[in-house]
C-alpha cells in the first residue's frame, strides 16, 4: 500500500509535585515501521527514562503507537519529540500548560 | 536571524585565563536555545567545548571539565568562555554557535577567534 | 565517549566527479548525525541534520544516507564550490564528537 505520515501530539499530565509526565502519540500511519522518542537538549534521552507502547493497528489498516517519559515542570523546552517514518520526521515539543499539540509530518 | 560574534584576547601566556565573549544579535539567550563554545586546533581537528543554555544551565566536555567556565550577561546578551590554566596545546580558532532542542547540530556559527598561547 | 572515524582524510577529485566521503560511529548513533563544509579560512556550515535531511539552501546534488554506526555523504556533479573540507558530528550524547574531516581538493 501508499505511504500515510502518522499525526504527531504530544500532551502532558501532572505526575507528582512538580513534575509532569509527557506523552507523544503517534496515529493513521502505514506502514507500521515508526521512530518515536523523546529527545532532552537535543540528544538523545536514555531508553530506561522512557516507556513505549506497542506499535497497534487502529482499525483503519493504519498504526498507532506512544512514547512518554517524566520531566520536571519548568524544563519543558529542553524536550522534543522525535519523529521518523518512511523517510520523513518531524520534531514536536511540548505544549505550554494545558494545551495539546496536533502536527503531520513535514520535511 | 541569528548572528553571533567571538571577541576577546589573540595572544595568552601559558598558565594564564583564556576568556572570550560571545554577543548575540537577533535573539535573546534567555528565550530558547543551547549556546555553546566549539574551537578548531591547527590541524583543523573540532572540539565541542560545552553549553550555557537559556536558563543558564551548563553543560562541559568532561575533557575540560576542570578548566572551564561558561557563564552569561543577560541584559547584554552575551556569554563567555572563560579556560583556565591554558598551555600551548590549547592554540585554536574558538566558536560560539547554538542548537535547538530539536537537535544537538549547529545551524549557525560565528565568524571565530584565533588564540595564541605563547610565552 | 563516541569516536567519529572519517575517511579518507584527504581525496582530489575533478568537477562534475561523483565523491563519497564516510563517517564510523564508535558506537550504534541512531542516525543522530550532522555534516558540515568548510572553506578555507571560514566558518563550517550545516549541510546535513538527523544523518539524512538536507540543511535550507543546500543543493541536490548533495545526499546523504546511512544508519546504526556507518554514514556518508555523496556529492554528485562535483562543483567549483563543493571544494574544501567536510566533517562529520554525532549528537547521540554528550560529548558532542567531530570526525577528524575529509579536505576535498582539485585534481
Known amino acids: 500500500g501508499s505511504t500515510v505520515p502518522p499525526m504527531v501530539n504530544v500532551t502532558r499530565s501532572e505526575a507528582s509535585e512538580g513534575n509532569i509526565t509527557v506523552t507523544c502519540r503517534a496515529s493513521g500511519f502505514y506502514p507500521w515501521n515508526i521512530t518515536l522518542s523523546w529527545r532532552q537538549d537535543g540528544v538523545s534521552l536514555s531508553h530506561d527514562t522512557q516507556q513505549w507502547g506497542d506499535v497497534l493497528p487502529d482499525g483503519n489498516g493504519t498504526y498507532q503507537t506512544w512514547v512518554a517519559t517524566r520531566i520536571c515542570q519548568g524544563e519543558e523546552q529542553r524536550f522534543t519529540c522525535y519523529m521518523e517514518h518512511s523517510g520523513n520526521h518531524s520534531t514536536h515539543p511540548v505544549p505550554s500548560g494545558n494545551s495539546h499539540h496536533h502536527h503531520h509530518h513535514h520535511h | 536571524d541569528v548572528q553571533l560574534q567571538e571577541s576577546g584576547p589573540g595572544l595568552v601566556k601559558p598558565s594564564q585565563s583564556l576568556s572570550l565573549t560571545c554577543t548575540v544579535t537577533?535573539?535573546?539567550?534567555?528565550?530558547?536555545?543551547?549556546w555553546n563554545w566549539i574551537r578548531q586546533f591547527p590541524r583543523n581537528k573540532l572540539e565541542w567545548m560545552g553549553y550555557?543554555?537559556?536558563?543558564?544551565?551548563?553543560n562541559y566536555n568532561p575533557s575540560l571539565k576542570s578548566r572551564i567556565s561558561i557563564t552569561r550577561d543577560t541584559s547584554k546578551n552575551q556569554f563567555f568562555l572563560q579556560l583556565i590554566s591554558v598551555t600551548t596545546e590549547d592554540t585554536a580558532t574558538y566558536y560560539c554557535?547554538?542548537?535547538?532542542?530539536?537537535?544537538?547540530?549547529?545551524?549557525?556559527w560565528g565568524q571565530g577567534t584565533l588564540v595564541t598561547v605563547s610565552a | 565517549d563516541i569516536q567519529m572515524t572519517q575517511s579518507p582524510a584527504s581525496l582530489s577529485a575533478s568537477v562534475g566527479e561523483t565523491v563519497t566521503i564516510t563517517c564510523r560511529a564508535s558506537?550504534?548513533?541512531?542516525?543522530?548525525l550532522a555534516w558540515y563544509q568548510q572553506k578555507q579560512g571560514k566558518s563550517p556550515q550545516l549541510l546535513v541534520y538527523?544523518?539524512?535531511m538536507l540543511a535550507d539552501g543546500v543543493p541536490s546534488r548533495f545526499s546523504a544516507s546511512g544508519s546504526g554506526t556507518q554514514y556518508s555523504l555523496k556529492i554528485n556533479s562535483l562543483q567549483p564550490e563543493d571544494f574544501g573540507s567536510y566533517y562529520c558530528q554525532h549528537f547521540w550524547s554528550f560529548p558532542l564528537t567531530f570526525g577528524a574531516g575529509t579536505k576535498v581538493e582539485i585534481k
Open positions: 554557535s547554538y542548537y535547538r532542542y530539536d537537535g544537538a547540530w549547529f545551524p549557525y
Open positions: 538527523n544523518a539524512i
Open positions: 537577533g535573539y535573546s539567550i534567555t528565550s530558547d536555545y543551547a
Open positions: 558506537g550504534n548513533i541512531h542516525n543522530y
Open positions: 550555557i543554555n537559556y536558563s543558564g544551565t551548563t
